[in-house]
């Protein structure tokens, strides 16, 4: 089938005293081969830094994804979401905190 | 000491191609990606696209996407723009930059790109 | 895309004066703006990063504020050396978009 870029949403949610953990979703995209990971300060972050979901068909013909990380509270802005899929790439900034997403469909 | 190091002044006819190259030192190539910028004379600064030099993937501008091809060489730790069927609004100042998570934190000198019959 | 409308284009100061300079998003792009510098024949140099975190190397004379869509640059006491043209640019989504310049000149 033809290539199907995905959808890119990050959330941030409250973890424990001082901590955030921020999170990158990637939905209807096809092929299934996706890179999704967390930079900081434009560099990838270590594997164990961050969590990864499956790549799961979301029952429309294209998958679904995410990674997540946990941060310092007040250094959202040193990270982005890397997304890398059939060639192309984007990367998505966490949004501030009276702001709770970041959808944006990749060209 | 974080380098950008663009290729010197091209003259070119409309119609043609152009390659300008950026060769990158003192940091990691692979690990950032590179941006392309350009400024027509006595305008202002319009982003054309991106490039993962660790993969080759790229994203580009949407009003550029059928004209410009952002590449990278490992080996050489350079990124490549090429431009083609030039016209003589693509007139410019062509720098590269890098990206160091939501900002560019370092440029190239810049590299005029003239077209001209 | 977003639209980013600087103002002034264009003034005229002394050595020793107070100069703002605006930025205005045609979106949220939360605190995802850079400022930079720009003098004849060179490239831009960054000034501020996440709109308010001053660069390496950068005096303390240069500060910005701001976040969402209104955003500032403020050169507290003008130098010989800061007459340029500055440059607003967002951050939050591709294509990453420029304010027109505003050209600080010699009064």
């Known amino acids: 089938g033809s290539t199907v870029p995905p959808m890119v949403n990050v959330t941030r949610s409250e973890a424990s005293e001082g901590n955030i953990t921020v999170t990158c979703r990637a939905s209807g995209f096809y092929p299934w081969n996706i890179t999704l990971s967390w930079r900081q300060d434009g560099v990838s972050l270590s594997h164990d830094t961050q969590q990864w979901g499956d790549v799961l068909p979301d029952g429309n013909g294209t998958y679904q994804t995410w990674v997540a990380t946990r941060i310092c509270q007040g250094e959202e802005q040193r990270f982005t979401c890397y997304m890398e899929h059939s060639g192309n790439h984007s990367t998505h900034p966490v949004p501030s905190g009276n702001s709770h997403h970041h959808h944006h469909h990749h060209h | 000491e974080v380098q950008l190091v663009q290729s010197g002044a091209e003259v070119k006819k409309p119609g043609a191609s152009v390659k300008v190259s950026c060769k990158a030192s003192?940091?990691?190539?692979?690990?950032?990606?590179i941006e392309w910028v350009r400024q027509a004379p006595g305008q202002g600064l319009e982003w054309i696209g991106a490039?993962?030099?660790?993969?080759?993937?790229?994203n580009y501008n949407e009003k550029f996407k059928d004209r410009a091809t952002l590449t990278a060489d490992k080996s050489t730790n350079t990124a490549y723009l090429e431009l083609s069927s030039l016209r003589s609004e693509d007139t410019a100042v062509y720098f590269c930059?890098?990206?160091?998570?939501?900002?560019?934190?370092?440029w190239g000198q810049g590299t005029l790109v003239t077209v001209s019959s | 895309d977003i639209q980013m409308t600087q103002s002034p284009s264009s003034l005229s100061a002394s050595v020793g004066d107070r100069v703002t300079i605006t930025c205005r998003a045609s979106?949220?792009?939360?605190?995802?703006l850079a400022w930079y510098q720009q003098k004849p024949g060179k490239a831009p140099k960054l000034l501020i990063y996440?709109?308010?975190t001053l660069a390496d190397g950068v005096p303390s004379r240069f500060s910005g504020s701001g976040s969402g869509t209104d955003f500032t640059l403020t050169i507290s006491s003008l130098q010989p050396e800061d007459f340029a043209t500055y440059y607003c640019?967002?951050?939050?989504?591709?294509?990453?978009?420029f304010g027109q310049g505003t050209k600080v000149e010699i009064k």
């Open positions: 930059a890098r990206f160091l998570g939501n900002y560019f934190d370092n």
């Open positions: 979106g949220n792009i939360h605190s995802y």
């Open positions: 003192g940091y990691a190539f692979t690990n950032y990606l």
């Open positions: 640019q967002q951050f939050w989504t591709t294509p990453y978009t």
């Open positions: 490039i993962n030099p660790g993969s080759g993937a790229t």
């Open positions: 996440y709109a308010e």
